[in-house]
């Protein structure tokens, strides 16, 4: 090879250590110190016998044909940085990687980057019970699902608890309650889903609401009214209260539903 006529241009390859779960993309960045006129960028993996196995070659915004398409090289807009990605990493992709640049004739020069290690771990949904280490970071979709399910469960539990408190603590109150039917069809979740009943909140009209609200006096029970929960399509007695078992599938009230189960 010709002796290099140009200044030595080191390559960097980062991160030095990268851990991804199987199925995720693993991306290294190979960076040139400067942008030569003409060069080829090679991406290598170190074999068990300490030889470099070429994964992909890149030149002038094109990648060598016929190579494994899981190994992708993409030039970034600054022209000096290149993303080297393994698409859907497999466990056996774990190993040592590096990049190399060949500065093309007339002044051929070959340059190699430092090495970097990739660890591809098994995909685990929950951490092992005996392991003290923290659970692997959940992917965005999974995290969203867990948060969503948790929120719904907490909401339903709170609603059940509140209903139970109201039903158990306060005496039957029939005065002022208005039983109003709803034309909305019951919600269906699927062909096999049990019938779900929505809660209909009667609109309660209280004269004292016209005035500016004041903090309730500690001993003024006459100022407090309670809504009665009525399930359409079932025989409703004037003094019927909802029990915890009758609230399966009940939807929490939305703001448009008017007053909820709170003391009014």
């Amino acid at each position: 090879l010709d002796s290099p006529d140009r200044p030595w241009s080191p390559l960097t390859f980062s991160p030095a250590q990268l851990t991804v779960q199987e199925g995720e993309n693993a991306t290294f960045t190979c960076s040139l110190a400067d942008i030569p006129d003409s060069f080829v960028l090679n991406w290598y993996r170190l074999s068990p016998r300490n030889q470099t196995d070429k994964l992909a070659a890149f030149q002038e915004d094109r990648i060598e044909p016929g190579r494994d398409r899981r190994f992708r090289v993409t030039r970034l807009p600054n022209g000096r940085d290149f993303h080297m990605s393994i698409v859907a990493a497999r466990l056996n992709d774990s190993g040592i990687y590096l990049c190399g640049a060949i500065y093309l004739p007339p002044n051929t020069q070959i340059n190699e980057s430092p090495r970097a290690e990739l660890s591809v771990t098994e995909r685990t949904l929950e951490p092992p019970t005996q392991s003290p280490s923290p659970p692997p970071r959940l992917s965005g979709q999974l995290q969203g699902l867990v948060i969503g399910v948790t929120s719904v469960l907490v909401g339903v539990l709170l609603l059940l608890l509140l209903t139970w408190v109201l039903a158990a603590v306060f005496p039957r109150a029939t005065r002022g309650a208005c039983v109003c039917g709803s034309e909305d069809e019951p919600l269906k979740e699927g062909p096999d889903a049990a019938p779900v009943f929505t809660l209909d909140y009667g609109e309660l009209d209280f004269q004292w609401r016209e005035k500016t609200p004041e903090p309730p006096a500690p001993c003024a029970p006459e100022q407090t009214e309670y809504a009665t929960i009525v399930f359409p399509g079932r025989p409703a007695s004037p003094g019927r209260r909802a029990s915890a078992s009758s609230l399966q599938g009940a939807q929490p009230p939305s703001p448009e539903d008017g007053p909820g189960l709170w003391p009014l």
Epitope: N42, K54, E60
Partner: antibody
Framework: ELTLQESGPGLVKPSQTLSLTCVVS?????????WNWIRQRPKRGLEWMGY?????HYNPAFQGRLSIDADTAQNHFSLQLSSMTTEDTAVYYC????????????WGQGILVTVSS | DIVMTQTPLSLSVSPGEPASIACKAS???????????LYWFRQKPGQSPQRLIY???NRDPGVPDRFSGSGSGTDFTLRITRVEADDAGVYYC?????????FGEGTKVELK
């Protein structure tokens, strides 16, 4: 100065397998470069056959009967072409390229292979 | 495969005279990166081919400036402004945009 030298039989019988070796001196056979075989049939143009660069890539016209390999310790690379016919009579060149396209910088002198019974 | 067609297949030129070889590709050799991958090779009698020009118009080191390449898309030309005795040989065009790489049949340049 890098030199490439082809060696092998000058005469092959039809249906036999051609084996050629390219010995490289003044440089190393490594997967940094592309080590090609190109042939030139009588009254025809140049025909790229394939290369080795740590892995192999072949011209589909030869797929199934062409094999290119390299021995980096011995500093040579080789060609095997099976099911030879008279149409395979040609001068065979080993060629180094610094990228995968026809950017060839060093050529062997070529070896004439005749297929005849 | 991309077919490369050269014309003429034979050319007889007097020393000092210009010479021109045409090469037509069956499809465009322009890549989306802006480069056109068209090459010219010369094979002197009894020798191996050597590349003269890469990417349409770039001369390889040591190639005299009497040689020039031009063209775009599918039509390309190699010109020798003043032919010398040393220029005799077979000239090939080749493409590097689509695998497999293919070459023209060659144009034989003889001196009168």
């Amino acid at each position: 100065e890098l030199t490439l030298q082809e060696s092998g039989p000058g005469l092959v019988k039809p249906s036999q397998t051609l084996s050629l070796t390219c010995v490289v001196s003044g440089g190393s056979v490594t997967n940094i470069f592309y080590w090609n075989w190109i042939r030139q049939r009588p009254k025809r143009g140049l025909e790229w056959m394939g290369y080795w660069s740590g892995y192999t890539h072949y011209n589909p016209a030869f797929q199934g009967r062409l094999s290119i390999d390299a021995d980096t310790a011995q500093n040579h690379f080789s060609l095997q072409l099976s099911s030879m016919t008279t149409e395979d009579t040609a001068v065979y060149y080993c060629v180094r390229g610094y990228i995968w396209t026809p950017d060839y910088d060093y050529w062997g002198q070529g070896i004439l292979v005749t297929v005849s019974s | 495969d991309i077919v490369m067609t050269q014309t003429p297949l034979s050319l007889s030129v007097s020393p000092g005279e210009p010479a021109s070889i045409a090469c037509k590709a069956s499809q465009s050799l322009l890549h989306s990166n802006g480069n056109t991958y068209l090459y010219w090779f010369r094979q002197k009698p009894g020798q191996s081919p050597q590349r003269l020009i890469y990417k349409v118009s770039n001369r390889d080191p040591g190639v005299p400036d009497r040689f020039s390449g031009s063209g775009s898309g599918t039509d390309f030309t190699l010109r020798i402004t003043r032919v010398e005795a040393d220029d005799a040989g077979v000239y090939y065009c080749g493409q590097g945009i689509q695998d497999p790489w293919t070459f023209g049949e060659g144009t034989k340049v003889e001196l009168k």
